[in-house]
């Protein structure tokens, strides 16, 4: 283990492991967020029966949650690193409004919801440094996001619970697809 300052002759510690590469750190960041989603899903599933509900399609129609498609170049067949990276960043930026919605949806996991939101912002920073074609990344319109947020918050209790469940499930799926794709880059 490294020796803190003042406790060795040179007053500086020797690192005890290889520095993290961009790919390793992004991988760890996604897994960190996925752990956070698991913690939030636990509360959601304990609080309501949404996780077993078959009425998901009803609520899903109102949501435009980012999804990976064949054309995004993130799947093994037709894999395209640049197109895929743009899709991942764009998707994460689109998820941000939904993560904002989640902020007031948890009683005992308020801190975890904030951690998921902030760690996603960090992931976007890491990925933007990796991306060469930043011009291709479209940032969501703040006005559109604000009205979407208002609309989601105005839903009845059942729909809000369902929306929370769907956001967490979709975000988890999106991150898992991203993780697989990024490991090929």
């Amino acid at each position: 283990a490294p020796v803190p300052p003042g406790e060795d002759s040179k007053d500086v510690a020797a690192p005890h492991r290889q520095p993290l590469t961009s790919s390793e750190r992004i991988d760890k960041q996604i897994r960190y967020i996925l752990d956070g989603i698991s913690a939030l899903r636990k509360e959601t599933c304990n609080k309501s029966n949404m996780c077993e509900s078959s009425k998901e399609a009803l609520a899903e129609n109102n949501l435009n949650l980012p999804k990976m498609a064949e054309k995004d170049g993130c799947f093994q067949s037709g894999f395209n690193e640049e197109t895929c990276l743009v899709k991942i960043i764009t998707g994460l930026l689109e998820f941000e409004v939904y993560l904002e919605y989640l902020q007031n949806r948890f009683e005992s996991s308020e801190e975890q919801a904030r951690a998921v939101q902030m760690s996603t912002k960090v992931l976007i920073q890491f990925l933007q440094k990796k991306a060469k074609n930043l011009d291709a990344i479209t940032t969501p319109d703040p006005t559109t996001n604000a009205s979407l947020l208002t609309k989601l918050q105005a839903q009845n209790q059942w729909l809000q619970d369902m929306t929370t469940h769907l956001i967490l499930r979709s975000f988890k799926e999106f991150l898992q697809s991203s993780l697989r794709a990024l490991r090929q880059m």
Epitope: A1, P2, P4, A13, P15, H16, R17, P19, L20, S22, R25, K28, Q29, Y32, D35, G36, A39, Q112, R114, A115, V116, M118, S119, K121, V122, Q125, F126, K129
Partner: nanobody, 131 residues
């Protein structure tokens, strides 16, 4: 060579301000949690502030709360400690350190200045608060 370098120390009058900056060479500081520590003459080293790399949580020791602010700059890959309303008791050698203790979801931010391990330390910079 993998190392941390710090800038911004010096002599300042009580009530004044200083900004310390920590940068890395040989690795990317953005990917690491960063802690600030200080050692006053004849005293033990104390952890005063830190910022995580995973979700940007911050922590401040009671002795600096409300006066010091830690922040990250992704454009420059640096971590800064803005020190305002400085007091003579803030005098000492200031160190920045980088570690990976924040990569497990549910980590305890308040342990960042105590029990967590850091991988890299810098050589330290002198801060003197005196009239």
């Amino acid at each position: 060579q993998l190392q941390l370098a710090e800038t911004g120390g010096g002599l300042v009058q009580p009530g004044g301000s200083l900004r310390l900056s920590c940068a890395a060479s040989g690795f990317t500081l953005d990917y690491y949690a960063v802690g600030w520590f200080r050692q006053a003459p004849g005293k033990e080293r104390e952890g005063i502030s830190c910022i995580s790399s995973s979700d940007l949580k911050t922590y401040y020791a009671d002795s600096v709360k409300g006066r010091f602010t830690i922040s990250r700059d992704y454009a420059k890959s640096t971590v800064s400690l803005q020190m305002n309303s400085l007091k003579p008791e803030d005098t000492g050698v200031y160190y920045c350190a980088a570690g990976t203790w924040d990569l497990k979801f549910g980590y305890n931010i308040s342990a960042c200045v105590g029990s967590y391990e850091y991988d890299y330390w810098d050589q330290g910079t002198q801060v003197t608060v005196s009239s």
